[in-house]
Interface confidence: medium
């Protein structure tokens, strides 16, 4: 399928240009969504190009500035949160990033009301975290590693915790680890629906090892960054969950929530936390061998005032055939009778879909069924489910929202997206309004980008909020590269794959031939979204083909395809790009002479042992910020996929995986290793032992590193990266600059 | 665009009273503190009086207090001044001014065009 | 009250010239200061907030420093269209109040 054609008529081709590095390094041809920000079922907010705050009434049409761009820049805010009563609104300013999702700020709050700023008992900075209440204007935000809590914003804060410590004891906000690999968040603390009860996480990280390296800076001497951190097998946070009434937070404080007993017994995480009433909330937990997850529902007793999570509200989830969950454990929506739910796990076949669960998982009513999977609910109302699949027309790198009528009997299932504007758009996400009244579609592509406006009862579209149109102008005279999505049988395994071609592409011809791979488990490449970047410019310019392959691993396939990684990682994700690359080979239109890989992080592992898998396919490749050892990554993540580093478990395997052990298979090939040296995610570590090893090998090698750069190369990196990243290939390639 | 226009200015005479009006448009009036700045002929800038956007607070210059009152109906999105036991030294033009609140400042960003009260027997 | 002292009470200048006011205070604004311009039978317009800001649509050529008691307003290539009166304001304390201001003639 052809899914971007190119505009090449003779008449054109004087016009029209190829891309450029520089277009790609200066986002020129980036792309806008809009997504609403909800405050009531017909209302939302929006920041205008100028930057005031401005609310939107649907039904009646009208708009006016909550906002002046003048507030916000008075205090240099770069966010702001209204508070649900809309008396005030906080704006956030000097953002400091940490990791992934943490940040630290300067937060001011403004009265609405009065037109000022709240002045007396202000703010601390910088700030970790901080959130209004779902209903009224209360604030909890956390300081220090400690929560604090004030009923309005001009009040003295109550001080919930006083235990917090840097780097030992983390109170309402993740550490390390549970931030990147387990919540995806930078909060660990949940208001209650009606803001009665404030819920929060303890991370305990006194006994965690250490991972330290050096941040040059530019003073005489480094600083030691210092980030507790387990790596596979290592000791492991230790988590608590809190729950304190808002209302009177001094009367009997925090109490805590008890851990099932069959998680207890032995090494655990806590895996999310969702509220379903003021007075009832459902704690996920798994083992640490992720294998067994169980959700708790538990209940306020108001004559102890305590929170009792009773056996029968216990409902497990156990795969048996890898890992519990795809990337995590999928969380419940409930439904308005407050105690059953829909909840996304694999059916007897092997494929995610949805299940309603009323009293137990095993008298679960499987709600959608097929070779497809669901992907995510959005939302529940009272006679509608809203969700997202990959079923249409069997493509599973397509998004398509579904609506599925729960109120009415049988319940019909309608596809809101499919026939929307079936060229452009069959990668979709939503965004709902408050009872599910209006929604947001957000169109990725594969055509330019679009986001609509719909209405929650018909789906009728009402507006456009953005289209892109200066995109849609910039790129008429650009000569896109082709992109097709298709896939290949091999031994009863389906690898689909997307590959780019150049815009005069000729079957003819031999082509270079580049492979992108991350194929990390539960990942997917091969999406139908619109992307103008770096390889895009490869093909649009340089003639390259490049082809991304989702190999065995990879989501939303089935549990056979993504399992068939578990324990042993670093295998077939490997042998199924090289299957691909040789059917790529047997298609006639590539010079098997000129075939490279690369990837970053998971895809640097992968790429780096393709290139030490002795086949002689690949003539070079490059390695951005990669694993090299299991032992070396997140205990979370890790030992997910691979158990434990210990003898009676997967040591064998850990041992055998590294890229390290093969370092003498790099001889024949041309290999850049890349990595920033402040990667607090994938260790400098990695590469360095790499180096070290083919070093002890004698096999020359290049290699890059960024001083104080994380695991994502940004800023000026980003630019120095792919200018020497483009140099290696083209020299690889034989291709002139 | 934003506008403020003011009316209700004239001659009056030592004692008498006076009601001025300034209209708005062009921006949410409700958000916003609002104030009078006078300049009598010849003279200089002087601050009057100002009133935050619900209302609830009012700050007055110490030689009109207890002589004159803002207030504002937001439902209107108008300002008012009104101005008892008038003096001579109140003659001057006045200005009717959208106040900007920021965090470290406060300013009178937008200003009609003045209205003219002349106080004289 | 917090009183406001600007000077010069007035200057001659000429176009492209390089032009300073100063304004300083009785006490301590922080930086609680406003500059505007007034011509004649005009209202006044806000110039610069905060000290040193800005305001939207004002020239580049208009800059502002200072913070505590001394404040200074530059004009760094004088303008046709830039002779008038120039005031000063503290907001930092009621009763507001402004410099007594600066004419700026050509010369």
């Known amino acids: 399928i052809v899914l971007r054609p190119s505009r090449v008529h003779n008449s054109e081709e004087n016009t029209m240009r190829a891309l450029t590095l520089k277009d790609i390094l200066n986002g020129t041809f980036s792309y806008k969504t809009f997504f609403p920000n909800w405050i009531s079922g017909q209302e939302y907010l929006h920041q205008s190009a100028d930057n005031n705050i401005v609310l939107y009434n649907i039904e009646t049409g009208q708009s006016y500035t909550i906002l002046s761009n003048r507030t916000m820049k008075s205090v240099n805010a770069s966010n702001y949160g209204l508070s649900p009563d809309r008396q005030f609104v906080y704006l956030e300013s000097d953002y400091s990033k940490l990791w992934r999702y943490s940040y630290t700020a300067t937060y001011y709050i403004y009265d609405l009301s009065n037109g000022e700023f709240v002045r007396g008992n202000e703010l601390p900075r910088p700030i970790q975290y901080l959130c209004w209440s779902p209903v009224g204007s209360k604030l909890a935000y956390v300081y220090q590693n400690n929560i604090y809590l004030k009923q309005r914003p001009g009040d003295p804060p109550f001080q919930i915790t006083f235990n917090g410590r840097e780097n030992k004891i983390f109170n309402g906000i993740p550490d390390w680890v549970y931030e990147e690999e387990m919540l995806a968040t930078k909060y660990a603390l949940w208001w209650s629906p009606n803001g009665k009860f404030l819920a929060y996480a303890e991370f305990n990280d006194t006994d965690i090892p250490v991972i330290a390296y050096s941040y040059y800076g530019d003073e005489q001497y480094p600083r030691t960054i210092n980030i507790p951190y387990p790596k596979a097998g290592a000791k492991n946070p230790v988590v608590r969950i809190f729950i304190i009434d808002t209302t009177y937070p001094a009367y009997v404080g925090p109490q805590e929530v008890p851990v099932p007993a069959m998680i207890a017994s032995s090494d655990y995480y806590f895996s999310w936390l969702t509220w379903v009433t003021d007075e009832r909330v459902c704690l996920q937990w798994l083992k640490r061998v992720q294998n067994v997850s169980v959700l708790s529902i538990c209940d306020f007793r108001e004559d102890w005032q305590t929170w009792d999570c009773p056996k029968t509200q216990e409902h497990i989830e156990e795969s048996r055939t890898g890992w519990a969950g795809g990337f995590f454990v999928s969380t419940p929506v409930f439904s308005y009778d407050a105690i059953s739910y829909y909840k996304i796990f694999s059916d007897k076949d092997g494929y995610k879909h949805i299940h309603y669960i009323k009293d137990t998982v095993e008298n679960a009513i499987q709600i959608t069924s097929g070779k497809w999977e669901a992907i995510n609910i959005f939302r529940v109302t009272q006679d509608s489910l809203f969700y997202s699949s990959n079923e249409f027309e069997e493509y599973p790198g397509r998004r398509n929202i579904y609506r599925i009528s729960i109120g009415s009997y049988p319940p019909s299932k309608k596809c809101v997206t499919c026939h929307l504007r079936k060229e452009r758009c069959q990668y979709y996400t939503a965004s709902f309004s408050d009872y599910a009244k209006y929604y947001a579609l957000v169109c990725y592509g594969p055509g330019i980008p679009i986001s609509t406006l719909h209405d929650g009862r018909t789906d009728q579209e009402i507006k456009i909020l953005e289209e892109n149109k200066e995109l849609e102008n910039a790129l008429k005279n650009i000569q896109l590269p082709k992109e097709e999505i298709k896939k290949l049988e091999v031994d009863e395994i389906t690898l689909w794959y997307k590959m780019i071609l150049p815009p005069q592409f000729d079957r003819s011809k031999k082509y270079p031939l580049l492979i992108q791979v991350y194929g990390g488990p539960c990942s997917q490449s091969v999406r139908s979204v619109f992307a103008v970047n770096w390889i895009s410019y490869l093909a649009s310019k340089e003639g390259m083909v490049i082809a991304l392959v989702d190999g065995r691993g990879t989501a939303f396939q089935g549990d056979k395809l993504l399992y068939a990684v578990y324990r042993k990682l670093g295998v077939y994700e490997v042998e199924d790009q090289i299957t691909a690359v040789r059917k790529f080979i047997e298609m006639g239109f590539i010079d098997e002479k000129r075939i490279a890989i690369w990837g970053w992080s998971y895809g640097g592992y992968v790429s780096s042992l393709a290139l030490a898998s002795g086949t002689g396919l690949f003539k070079c490749g490059i390695a951005v910020a990669p694993v090299s050892s299991w032992e070396y990554y997140a205990s979370v993540y890790t030992e997910r996929f691979m158990g434990l580093p210990t003898k009676d478990d997967n040591l064998e395997h850990y041992k055998n995986s590294t890229v390290m052990a093969r370092a003498e298979y790099f001889r024949n090939v041309d290999y850049l290793l890349i990595h920033g040296t402040a990667d607090d995610n994938v260790h400098f570590q990695n590469s360095a032992q790499i180096a070290k090893a083919l070093v002890n090998a004698q096999v020359d090698f290049q290699a890059m590193w960024y001083s104080d750069q994380n695991h994502g190369l940004s800023g000026l990196s980003t630019n120095h990266l792919y200018t020497h990243m483009t140099h290696f290939l083209k020299q690889c390639f034989s291709l002139s600059d | 665009e934003v506008q403020l226009l003011e009316s209700g200015g004239g001659l009056v005479q030592p004692g008498g009273s006076l009601r001025l009006s300034c209209a708005a448009s062009g921006f949410t009036f409700s958000r916003y503190a609002m104030t009078w700045v006078r300049q009598a002929p010849g003279k200089g800038l002087e601050w009057v009086s100002s009133?935050?956007?619900?209302?609830?607070?009012?700050y007055y210059a110490d030689s009109v207090k207890g002589r004159f009152t803002i207030s504002r109906d937001n439902s209107k999105n108008t300002l008012y001044l009104q101005m008892n036991s008038l003096r001579a030294e109140d003659t001057a033009v006045y200005y009717c001014?959208?106040?900007?609140?920021?965090?470290?400042?406060?300013?009178?960003?937008?200003w009609g065009q003045g209205t003219l009260v002349t106080v004289s027997s | 009250d917090i009183q406001m002292t600007q000077s010069p009470s007035s200057l001659s200048a000429s176009v492209g010239d390089r032009v300073t006011i100063t304004c300083r205070a009785s006490q301590s604004i922080s930086s609680y200061l406003n500059w505007y311009q007034q011509k004649p039978g005009k209202a006044p317009k806000l110039l610069i907030y905060a000290a040193s800001s800005l305001q939207s649509g004002v020239p580049s050529r208009f800059s502002g420093s200072g913070s505590g008691t001394d404040f200074t307003l530059t004009i760094s290539s004088l303008q046709p269209e830039d002779f008038a009166t120039y005031y000063c304001?503290?907001?930092?304390?009621?009763?507001?109040?402004f410099g007594q201001g600066t004419k700026l003639e050509i010369k």
């Open positions: 001014a959208k106040t900007f609140s920021g965090y470290a400042h406060y300013d009178f960003d937008y």
């Open positions: 304001q503290q907001s930092y304390s009621t009763p507001y109040t």
């Open positions: 009133i935050s956007a619900s209302g609830g607070s009012t």
